[in-house]
Interface confidence: low
């Protein structure tokens, strides 16, 4: 599984993280969890192994099985959302996952992230800096 090493977005804005996976994992449960350590991170939201999107509070997840990419969106970002997150795939044995560091810039602070043309407070990341975690 591959995703961005870190993402940055403004406070009160939103961000979208795209995590890519290999063929064969299409119908597995995909998840997004929070926590510095892989073994103690906790699931915030997960798919049901289908392409049906799921939403919980300010976090949503959608799996595009044709493109083998699942997309996580966090909205209404707050400073205390800044943390280490993981996108992962549930399977028998150890789950697959990759770490994503989320940085939230305080309101008024300059952001180095290019804005989406449709929403000046939305940052989209597709993993230009990729890392693998198994």
């Amino acid at each position: 599984i591959q995703g961005p090493e870190s993402v940055r977005a403004p406070e009160q804005g939103s961000l979208t993280v795209q995590c890519h996976y290999k063929q064969g994992w299409e119908t597995y449960i995909k998840w997004w969890c929070r926590g510095v350590r892989w073994d103690t991170c906790k699931i915030l939201i997960e798919t049901r192994g289908s392409e049906q999107g799921e939403k919980s509070d300010r976090v949503s997840i959608k799996d595009n099985q044709k493109d083998r990419t699942f997309t996580v969106t966090m909205e209404g970002l707050r400073r205390d959302d800044a943390d280490v997150y993981w996108c992962g795939i549930e399977r028998r044995g150890p789950d697959l996952g990759t770490q994503v560091k989320v940085i939230v810039d305080p309101e008024g602070a300059a952001s180095t992230t290019a804005s989406s043309p449709t929403n000046s407070n939305m940052a989209v990341f597709i993993g230009s800096h990729k890392r693998n975690h198994y």
Epitope: V36, T40, K42, I43, E46, D57, D80
Partner: antibody, heavy 126, light 107 residues
Framework: QVQLVQSGAEVKKPGASVKVSCKAS????????VHWVRQAPGQGLEWMGI????????NYAQKFQGRVTMTRDTSTSTVYMELSSLRSEDTAVYYC???????????????????WGQGTTVTVSS | DIQMTQSPSSLSASVGDRVTITCRAS??????LNWYQQKPGKAPKLLIY???TLQSGVPSRFSGSGSGTDFTLTISSLQPEDFATYYC?????????FGQGTKVEIK
């Protein structure tokens, strides 16, 4: 001392809604997540969901999605659980419970429930 | 959802007995396993969290072990106040499911 005090017993008709409150004291309200758990008469424990009192963020068990709403009022250190479209099977004792690990401990999340409210009996009957 | 299965569902024991309750998860939950004690008409009480960590104030006769899918709660020497129902609970994956409970009764 650390405690959670819940609102009193409720009797509701099928189709109605109930809102149970849980007032926290003795600790920093916004630092610990709060769970809701219910127990039908003579049955086991059933986890309903969790709320982050700092952000208001919630996670609900799929079974209750669309029927349950958990909210908080930081000014009164109170969390609320509202369950709608009540049916007879919702007759139960509803508990709020504080998580054991503070949310600002980034190495652990939602380990267990160390402080419980006294429970609120909700009876659904026509 | 992760299913938690406890055994036995009930047991009869005498004061001083060593009692063992097992809990099995339908998939690996690492060490995210908690044990609660509940007495009739009362709220549950946390005994052990993270498989083996004794909650503050809980007597040392209670202990927990296991990892992955199989876990055990042991009461080394049963006391009169220990007659109650015991529940395991996983806190690995939402929803945080409970076992069906084990009722410990006086023989």
């Amino acid at each position: 001392q650390v405690q959670l005090v819940q609102s009193g017993a409720e009797v509701k008709k099928p189709g109605a809604s109930v809102k149970v409150s849980c007032k926290a004291s003795g600790y920093t309200f916004t630092t610990y997540a709060v769970h809701w758990v219910r127990q039908a008469p003579g049955q086991g424990l059933e986890w309903m969901g969790i709320i982050n009192p700092n952000s208001g963020g919630t996670n609900y068990a799929q079974k209750f999605q669309g029927r349950v709403t958990m909210t908080r009022d930081t000014s009164t250190s109170t969390v609320y659980m509202e369950l709608s479209s009540l049916r007879s099977e919702d007759t139960a004792v509803y508990y709020c419970a504080r998580d054991i690990v503070p949310m600002n401990n980034f190495y652990n999340y939602y380990y267990g429930m160390d402080v419980w409210g006294q429970g609120t009996t909700v009876t659904v009957s026509s | 959802d992760i299913q938690m299965t406890q055994s036995p569902s009930s047991l009869s024991a005498s004061v001083g007995d060593r009692v063992t309750i097992t809990c099995r998860a339908s998939q690996s939950i690492s060490s995210y396993l908690n044990w609660y004690q509940q007495k009739p008409g009362k709220a549950p009480k946390l005994l052990i969290y993270a498989t083996s960590t004794l909650q503050s104030g809980v007597p040392s006769r209670f202990s927990g072990s296991g990892s992955g899918t199989d876990f055990t709660l042991t009461i080394s020497s049963l006391q009169p106040e220990d007659f109650a129902t015991y529940y395991c609970q996983q806190s690995y994956r939402i929803p945080y499911t409970f076992g069906q409970g084990t009722k410990v009764e006086i023989k």
